[in-house]
């Protein structure tokens, strides 16, 4: 699983790339995306 902390501190990533990774994780884990 990819934690929010990891994602928000992943340097050099675009905001869309973070959203992309969140959404891919959401589709698997069904976590709420808001």
């Amino acid at each position: 699983a990819v934690s929010e902390h990891q994602l928000l501190h992943d340097k050099g990533k675009s905001i869309q790339d973070l959203r992309r990774r969140f959404f891919l994780h959401h589709l698997i884990a069904e976590i709420h995306t808001a």
Epitope: S14, D17, F22, H25, E30
Partner: antibody
Framework: QVQLVESGGGVVQPGRSLRLSCAAS????????MSWVRQAPGKGLEWVAT????????YYPDSVKGRFTISRDNSKNTLYLQMNSLRAEDTAVYYC???????????WGQGTLVTVSS | QLVLTQSPSASASLGASVKLTCTLS???????IEWYQQQPLKPPKYVMD???????STGDGIPDRFSGSSSGADRYLSISNIQPEDEAMYIC?????????????FGGGTKVTVL
């Protein structure tokens, strides 16, 4: 290996309905989001619908919202696309696709052709 | 509006190299995209995802002759030592989530011919 096999395509009149199926094997179906992508004859690809692993979340483009419904039966390892109020512009090969942790459409089926014509 | 632009065609001699371009709409120049290969009469195949910094992850069974790079709003797919089986349509795609809605768009594709 991942296998996705679509079925249910055929010729249908405008305004009628059709349900497509995608039988999945070679992986734990209930662990992944799934999608439908279509390709009109001689044209480009168009994303049609996406559903989360357990079926709780669904997503559609405006072109099909309110007419198409994506669903899944994890006990049968099967993905569905219910298509209502079909139009000529819905004529296409419909592919099902599986996500990975890295990307949306990592694995694709062979496709099933839907022809909407009177 | 999220838009991807691709040249309709490209060609290369057997064993040579070719570099394909997918251009993002200017306000989306930092976006990660995906590349797909579609051989004639076959379904699309995932090739790679490609980030703004040029880093990429390739799909199953993709030879290391395929590589990706980025510059500004341009995302490139390079094929070195091109082979007959590389003759195909190459399509880029990009997704985003906006206000809890998902959107995914594809480019028009570039048809690659091996001479």
């Amino acid at each position: 290996q991942v296998q996705l096999v679509e079925s249910g395509g055929g010729v249908v009149q405008p305004g009628r309905s059709l349900r497509l199926s995608c039988a999945a094997s070679g992986f734990t179906f209930s662990s992944y989001g799934m999608s439908w992508v279509r390709q009109a004859p001689g044209k480009g690809l168009e994303w049609v619908a996406t559903i989360s692993s357990g079926g709780s979340y669904t997503y559609y483009p405006d072109s099909v919202k309110g007419r198409f419904t994506i669903s899944r039966d994890n006990s049968k390892n099967t993905l569905y696309l219910q298509m209502n109020s079909l139009r000529a512009e819905d004529t296409a090969v419909y592919y099902c696709a599986r996500q990975t942790t890295m990307t949306y459409f990592a694995y694709w089926g062979q496709g099933t052709l839907v022809t909407v014509s009177s | 509006q999220l838009v991807l632009t691709q040249s309709p065609s490209a060609s290369a001699s057997l064993g040579a190299s070719v570099k394909l371009t997918c251009t993002l709409s200017s306000q989306h120049s930092t976006y990660t995209i995906e590349w797909y290969q579609q051989q004639p009469l076959k379904p699309p195949k995932y090739v790679m995802d490609l980030k703004q910094d040029g880093s990429h992850s390739t799909g199953d069974g993709i030879p290391d002759r395929f590589s990706g790079s980025s510059s500004g709003a341009d995302r490139y797919l390079s094929i070195s030592n091109i082979q007959p089986e590389d003759e195909a349509m190459y399509i880029c795609g990009v997704g985003d989530t906006i206000k809890e809605q998902f959107v995914y768009v594809f480019g028009g594709g570039t048809k690659v011919t091996v001479l």
